[in-house]
């Protein structure tokens, strides 16, 4: 279960890494993998990567999609390879939701 406390020696998973935070790497290792989409000053920014620390991803992964950001998380080797985060399909435009970042 997602709410379970992490074990003392938590399992690390290999995750696909895409986006600015990855540098030249195409993968990373962490306790959770993620795939995200955010609207940043009008641009759609896609990122994939990992949360090294369980607590780091806990709140982010529980955040429901908003008009400006969506994050999907998973646990398992390469589990984010075929996951593409999608914004909720409500309406066409996004005035007022210009700056969202996945920190």
């Amino acid at each position: 279960m997602e709410d379970e406390k992490p074990k003392v020696n938590p399992k690390l998973y290999m995750c696909v890494c895409e986006g600015l935070s990855c540098g030249n790497e195409d993968h990373c290792e962490g306790q959770q993998c993620f795939s995200s989409l955010s609207i940043n000053d009008g641009f759609h920014v896609y990122q994939k990567g990992c949360f090294q620390v369980y607590e780091q991803g806990k709140m982010t992964c529980k955040t429901p999609p908003s008009p400006g950001q969506a994050v999907e998380c998973c646990q398992g080797d390469w589990c984010n390879r075929n996951i593409t985060a999608q914004l909720p399909t409500k309406g066409k435009s996004f005035p007022g939701t210009q700056n969202f970042h996945l920190e």
Partner: antibody, heavy 121, light 108 residues
Framework: EVQLVESGGGLVQPGGSLRLSCAAS????????MSWVRQAPGKGLEWVSA????????YYADSVKGRFTISRDNSKNTLYLQMNSLRAEDTAVYYC??????????????WGQGTMVTVSS | EIVMTQSPATLSVSPGKRATLSCRAS??????LAWYQQKPGQAPRLLIY???TRATGIPARFSGSGSGTEFTLTISSLQSEDFAVYYC??????????FGQGTKLEIK
């Protein structure tokens, strides 16, 4: 109705300059990143440049970097492309385009009709 | 830069038949791929986004599939108005946004 209308194309000599405009209507202009995409006669589509909604971030294809400048005036709902040091290979129809439906994830679903730029002596 | 490669360059198919167009990315673009249709003298028209979802107003005979590096656009029963040039484009890793070189679909 969401609409993009380009203007400013024409015939220019190699080394010359030209400024293209794209007038937008029907949406909140400042919320959208916008791009220029070009198509040389008989060739495919080539992304040229993009600018963020506020105008604070700009991006260019390597083929135009240092020669073209993208800008926008959000008070006039207008996108610009300043083209300097023009070359014969810049000859193309220039389109402005936006990913209007935000749930389309960045695909360009709104395009202008295009404006033709011919670079020739 | 991600390179998009389309095949074939030209496809000749009879009206009423099925057409299958391919697009390959030099590295994964997840499902962040679009297909466009362009007719002579017109601007491109978005057909498919997210690799497999039809844009508003696009007929059901158009379908997209694939993820990662291999993508396919299928037109199930070709109508006369479907003969045009088709482009794929990735919007996963930018800049630059990159397009394939196009596939010309012509009447056999």
């Amino acid at each position: 109705e969401v609409q993009l209308v380009e203007s400013g194309g024409g015939l220019v000599q190699p080394g010359g300059s030209l400024r293209l405009s794209c007038a937008a209507s029907g949406f909140t202009f400042s919320s959208y990143a916008m791009s220029w995409v070009r198509q040389a006669p008989g060739k495919g589509l080539e992304w040229v440049s993009a600018i963020s909604g506020s105008g604070g971030s700009t991006y260019y294809a390597d083929s135009v970097k240092g020669r073209f400048t993208i800008s926008r005036d959000n008070s006039k709902n207008t996108l610009y492309l300043q083209m300097n040091s023009l070359r014969a290979e810049d000859t193309a129809v220039y389109y402005c385009a936006i990913p209007y439906n935000w749930n389309y994830g960045g695909a360009f679903d709104i395009w202008g009709q295009g404006t033709m730029v011919t670079v020739s002596s | 830069e991600i390179v998009m490669t389309q095949s074939p360059a030209t496809l000749s198919v009879s009206p009423g038949k099925r057409a299958t167009l391919s697009c390959r990315a030099s590295q994964s673009v997840s499902s962040n791929l679009a297909w466009y249709q362009q007719k002579p003298g017109q601007a491109p028209r978005l057909l498919i986004y997210g690799a497999s979802t039809r844009a508003t107003g696009i007929p059901a005979r158009f379908s997209g599939s694939g993820s990662g590096t291999e993508f396919t656009l299928t037109i199930s029963s070709l109508q006369s108005e479907d003969f045009a040039v088709y482009y794929c484009q990735q919007y996963n890793n930018w800049p630059p946004y990159t397009f394939g070189q196009g596939t010309k679909l012509e009447i056999k």
